[in-house]
Interface confidence: medium
Amino acid sequence: LEVQVPEDPVVALVGTDATLCCSFSPEPGFSLAQLNLIWQLTDTKQLVHSFAEGQDQGSAYANRTALFPDLLAQGNASLRLQRVRVADEGSFTCFVSIRDFGSAAVSLQVAAPYSKPSMTLEPNKDLRPGDTVTITCSSYQGYPEAEVFWQDGQGVPLTGNVTTSQMANEQGLFDVHSILRVVLGANGTYSCLVRNPVLQQDAHSSVTITPQRSPTGAVEVQVPEDPVVALVGTDATLRCSFSPEPGFSLAQLNLIWQLTDTKQLVHSFTEGRDQGSAYANRTALFPDLLAQGNASLRLQRVRVADEGSFTCFVSIRDFGSAAVSLQVAAPYSKPSMTLEPNKDLRPGDTVTITCSSYRGYPEAEVFWQDGQGVPLTGNVTTSQMANEQGLFDVHSVLRVVLGANGTYSCLVRNPVLQQDAHGSVTITGQPMT
């Protein structure tokens, strides 16, 4: 006997009624006296509802089920489940027996929409740039468990410093609490989205935080105007200073260093204590100088990836901030020169001269000239490839037609260090030994 049920799960909202469809094809002359119909939970075999001996035997499932008696004779064995609960979720098997028998299982997927999230801030007043704020996003009474997403005002997903917990209540419905910890910039919008994966229902809320400026004016924070140039592998000091007022103590100081673009925390001093490096353990303050207003940051073993802008936030009673740029540099090696071909050279031959210089940063400027100091710009191809550390290897190729003899010089200039490295080759139109 062929018994048909829907392939896809039946989705039902908590508290509503659901129909679990099941049908069979009655033969001519079929009567209900011949029918045995049993609905049971697939896993536990617990009886849910039955029809036997020509009679509806009623619900064995908390009196919340019913058949469609007027439709049974046409082969409709569907089950109505009333006031759906989370606990009803699962697979139900429909057994039909006339002379032969057949069965099929239908899945019930229970769902409940999440409420619009509420957003809370801690602390929620006297906020200043550089403060660490905990934003909590709470949404209630949903099912199944939610997916939670955060993003900033530019639509960038925020995945770090997020902690999400989901607790089921007595009815099995979930309350979601997601906590985002952020260091405040000048202002910012933070949005939380709670998604019900079954209903594809989105509930979201935003909070915009505008830190207050103190009416008495800001702390003046001073940093160098020019970028700080640091060689790869050396230590760099990002200078930052403020003017402490009489009676100032370190207990009043909040100092935050962060990456200007991404707001990533680099180092902080709060609650009278150095909170340490949040940047690969390569940063340090000058603790003995803080009380005198020296908020400088020491960055050790500088890497190419460190290049960029760092913001120094100082908050006492008032606050102030300033950004300092770090320009990373690495000197280029003395160029090596190669010739191709490198023997049996005659005037009129075309020669390729390659000038190679290694492990510099940033990208080099490459210049060629002949023995008379005349710049050579035609037939020059220069390529610069960065290695895993971000350092560049430079290969510049000059193609020349030989005269009787000639000197060719290549200069590799580091534009930041104003460092010049050069190599020369002298070619005489004689067979080379």
């Epitope: 005002g153 530019q154 639509g155 960038v156 997903p157 995945t159 919008t189 989105d202």
Partner: antibody, heavy 121, light 106 residues
């Protein structure tokens, strides 16, 4: 009809800068975040960053930090992407692309026709 | 950064074939999006949020997957489907694209 129309092809020398524009029409410019994606010849797609036209806030791919600047002029519904210190590897087609309307739509539903930038000495 | 690896990098198929391509993420992502690009043209959104069909896209395209493994399927390849297909994620910054799968005529 929603459209993003970009400025024409550019040829630049190494070390120079290029500024590409993207004019939006057929929708409210300030309601969608605008991003920039580039594609080198024969290569895949590379995200550069985006700008929120409502606030002017930007987000950049760290690979381009210090070299890329994104701006907008809301009065003419136009976004701009400027790339400085050009090198030969920056030769590519540059696309502006509109992020989906919902705040949490992390994909691009409308693209400009592309602007070819050639960097050559 | 989350790396997206698409396989195969290219495939040859005939009109009417069922075509499947995969996108593997170096760590778990919430959603994957798919684009189609034809030579000399801008990419076009095909599938968003892993399995939702973008406006105007034929139902022969479908997407599936979760975690780190995602699939784009074309149930019956049509002449206009010969193109390069890219996956994209932004569950974690920065936004990244896969290297692409080129679908060519056999």
């Amino acid at each position: 009809e929603v459209q993003l129309v970009q400025s024409g092809a550019e040829v630049k020398k190494p070390g120079a800068s290029v500024k590409v524009s993207c004019k939006a029409s057929g929708y409210t410019f300030t309601e969608y975040i605008m991003h920039w994606v580039r594609q080198a010849p024969g290569q895949g797609l590379e995200w550069m960053g985006g700008i929120n036209p409502a606030s002017g806030g930007t987000t950049y791919n760290q690979k381009f930090k210090g070299r890329v600047t994104m701006t907008r002029d809301t009065s003419i519904s136009t976004a701009y992407m400027e790339l400085s210190r050009l090198r030969s590897e920056d030769t590519a087609v540059y696309y502006c692309a509109r992020k989906g309307k919902d705040y949490f739509d992390w994909y691009f539903d409308v693209w400009g026709q592309g602007t070819t930038v050639t960097v050559s000495s | 950064d989350i790396q997206l690896t698409q396989s195969p990098s290219s495939l040859s198929a005939s009109v009417g074939d069922r075509v499947t391509m995969t996108c593997s993420a170096s760590s778990s992502v919430s959603y994957m999006h798919w684009y189609q690009q034809k030579p000399g043209k801008a990419p076009k959104l095909l599938i968003y949020d892993t399995s939702k069909l973008a406006s105007g896209v034929p139902s022969r395209f479908s997407g599936s997957g979760s975690g780190t493994d995602f699939t784009l399927t074309i149930s019956s390849l049509q002449p206009e489907d010969f193109a390069t297909y890219y996956c994209q994620q932004w569950s974690s910054a920065p936004l990244t694209f896969g290297g692409g799968t080129k679908v060519e005529i056999k």
